[in-house]
Interface confidence: medium
């Protein structure tokens, strides 16, 4: 199916930028992995690079405004021609759900006191309004609540006094038309406009003030243009060469509004001065390599020793990573493929332990299913031996940090019948549905 092809993918917003054109295949658009595509206008934008997870969205608002609720956030697998970690297809959303509380208590309504006395009338002549007020304190509201209805009410009042009416001008009438529309006639054209003292007229009894100023004005017609000439397009120029050496590019033709040139305010040529076409080099663009995440550390060993576990003997271990995705003469990955460090092995060592404090509450699981729960734990944490934190392995090479490695066997006193982990679970409340913000349908 043809797609809309773009020259840029904006990571921060997930939007396609720089429309190249439509009617091309995904495969042709993605000859350049810096490009991006949309299956339809306004649809989901997918970059041409190999798929990876987007940043997490901000947390959605809490599902309730007071007491405990839940909130969701998501990230999307974006890219082309592959899968994200977890063997997930591009376009898929991954969700997280957590408990939230915008306000501990919920608002409670208050009640009104009785009405106070009426204030004086708002005017000294004709008709006005008067107001009275009451207080929201019978009882006072709680937790940001309010009283139903209004704190003040108004009614009409009449002073029994007639007010004077002062005169005011109505808006100016239109200018009379000039005698000519192009300059160069025998007489200097004039234009006039007038207005009436009728918005309102001044009253007779009691007497109102008349309108200030003149009822008409006159001016010369200036700046009349010479008569206009409309512009016309010249022929299309040659097609520019394809500006890229790989993937898709855009060529252009231009024409000039000079056949004739518009004169004396005549209209410019209608339509576009340039038109573009997609050009296809059919050559894939280079793809730079990207490091995979580091692998696991190898066991901590020392050459010519069978085991150094549970002993104050420093060893060495390494981990590696793979440079993936390099194609079509792209750059190799920068940096080291192997990482080496010094270590003490505490693999399977029986160590004295102590119970940790409660962890923070975890995320709600499952976020997109019924009855999600959250948990927190206390762990039996091993007390690490007081071995030297640095060693000098070779004379003159300075001190090297030494890291503990391995899974020890911590021993703690039993807590709630458990030896290693004590867990507490709670249900998550007022859970919203996992709905795609794009609400794309296939």
């Amino acid at each position: 199916d043809p797609v809309l092809c773009f020259t840029q993918y904006e990571e921060s917003s997930g939007k396609c930028k720089g429309l190249l054109g439509g009617g091309v295949s995904v495969e042709d658009c993605c000859l350049n992995t810096a490009f991006a595509y949309q299956k339809r206008s306004g649809g989901l934008c997918q970059p041409c690079r190999s798929p990876r997870w987007s940043l997490w969205s901000t947390w959605a608002p809490c599902s309730v405004t007071c007491s405990e609720g839940s909130q969701l956030r998501y990230r999307r697998c974006v890219g082309w021609n592959g899968q994200c970690s977890g063997k997930v297809a591009p376009g898929t959303l991954e969700w997280q759900l957590q408990a939230c509380e915008d306000q501990q208590c919920c608002p409670e309504m208050g009640g009104w006191s009785g009405w106070g006395p009426w204030e004086p009338c708002s005017v000294t002549c004709s008709k006005g309004t008067r107001t009275r007020r009451r207080a929201c304190n019978h009882p006072a509201p709680k937790c940001g609540g309010h009283c139903p209805g209004q704190a003040q009410e108004s009614e009409a009042c009449d002073t029994q006094q007639v007010c004077p009416t002062h005169g005011a001008w109505a808006t100016w009438g239109p200018w009379t038309p000039c005698s000519a529309s192009c300059h160069g006639g025998p007489h200097e054209p004039k234009e006039t406009r007038s207005r009436k003292c009728s918005a309102p007229e001044p009253s007779q009894k009691p007497p109102g003030k008349p309108c200030p100023g003149l009822a008409y004005e006159q001016r010369r017609c200036t700046g009349l243009p010479p008569c206009p000439v409309a512009g016309g397009w010249g022929p299309w120029g040659p097609v520019s060469p394809c500006p890229v050496t790989c993937g898709l590019g855009q060529t252009m033709e231009q024409r000039t509004c000079n056949h004739p040139v518009p004169q004396h305010g005549g209209p410019f040529c209608a339509g576009d001065a340039t038109r573009t076409h997609i050009c296809n080099t059919a050559v894939p663009c280079p793809v730079d390599g990207e490091w995979d995440s580091w692998g696991e550390w190898s066991p901590c060993i020392r050459r010519n020793m069978k085991s150094i576990s549970c002993q104050e003997i420093p060893g060495q271990q390494s981990r590696g990573r793979t440079c993936r995705g390099r194609k079509f003469d792209g750059h190799r990955c920068a940096g080291q493929q192997q990482d080496i460090r010094h270590c003490y092995s505490i693999q399977h060592c029986p160590l004295k332990g102590s119970w940790s404090e409660w962890s923070t509450w975890g995320l709600c699981m499952p976020p997109c299913g019924p009855n999600p729960t959250r948990a927190r734990q206390r762990l039996c944490t091993p007390l690490l031996p007081k071995y030297p934190p640095t060693v000098s392995m070779v004379e003159g090479q300075g001190e090297k940090n030494v890291t503990f490695w391995g899974r020890p066997l911590p021993r703690c006193e039993e807590l709630q019948g458990q030896k290693l982990v004590v867990e507490e679970k709670r249900p998550c409340l007022h859970v919203p549905a996992c709905k795609d913000p794009e609400e794309e349908e296939l």
Epitope: T92, L93, P366, C368, P370, C434, D436, E439
Partner: nanobody, 129 residues
């Protein structure tokens, strides 16, 4: 473990209608997202429609949009596919599939067969010209 059994397939004239049902065993049916897929002779299995666990969202493949409707009745542990304005190219074996509650959602996710944990045996739908 969930067992899925499809029914309601058969022979129908072009322009006619059929309603497929998929009955699920197990008390947790209401927590599963459900999908329908189909496979015509000599072709790959393709996505037809899907519905989320509480029915908040439904998704359809382009060729069936506006003609097929997916729905579910959690009280009866059943998901339905109402098919109308049927065409000869709708002829296929129709399979029902269930996805356990997960961290993922969206049309791109539900259209992938790999996203589903359990599958039925299928029911044959034949549309004659």
């Amino acid at each position: 473990q969930v067992q899925l059994v499809e029914s309601g397939g058969g022979l129908v004239q072009a322009g006619g209608s059929l309603r497929l049902s998929c009955a699920a065993s197990g008390r947790t049916f209401s927590s599963y997202a459900m999908g329908w897929f189909r496979q015509a002779p000599g072709k790959e299995r393709e996505f037809v429609a899907a519905i989320t666990w509480r029915g908040a969202s439904t998704y359809y493949a382009d060729p069936v949009k506006g003609r097929f409707t997916i729905s579910r009745d959690n009280a009866k542990n059943t998901v339905y596919l109402q098919m109308s304005s049927l065409k000869p190219e709708d002829t296929a074996v129709y399979y029902c599939a269930a996805e356990e509650p997960s961290y993922y959602s969206g049309s791109y996710y539900y259209m992938m067969g790999d996203s589903y944990n359990y599958w039925g045996q299928g029911t044959q739908v034949t549309v004659s010209g």
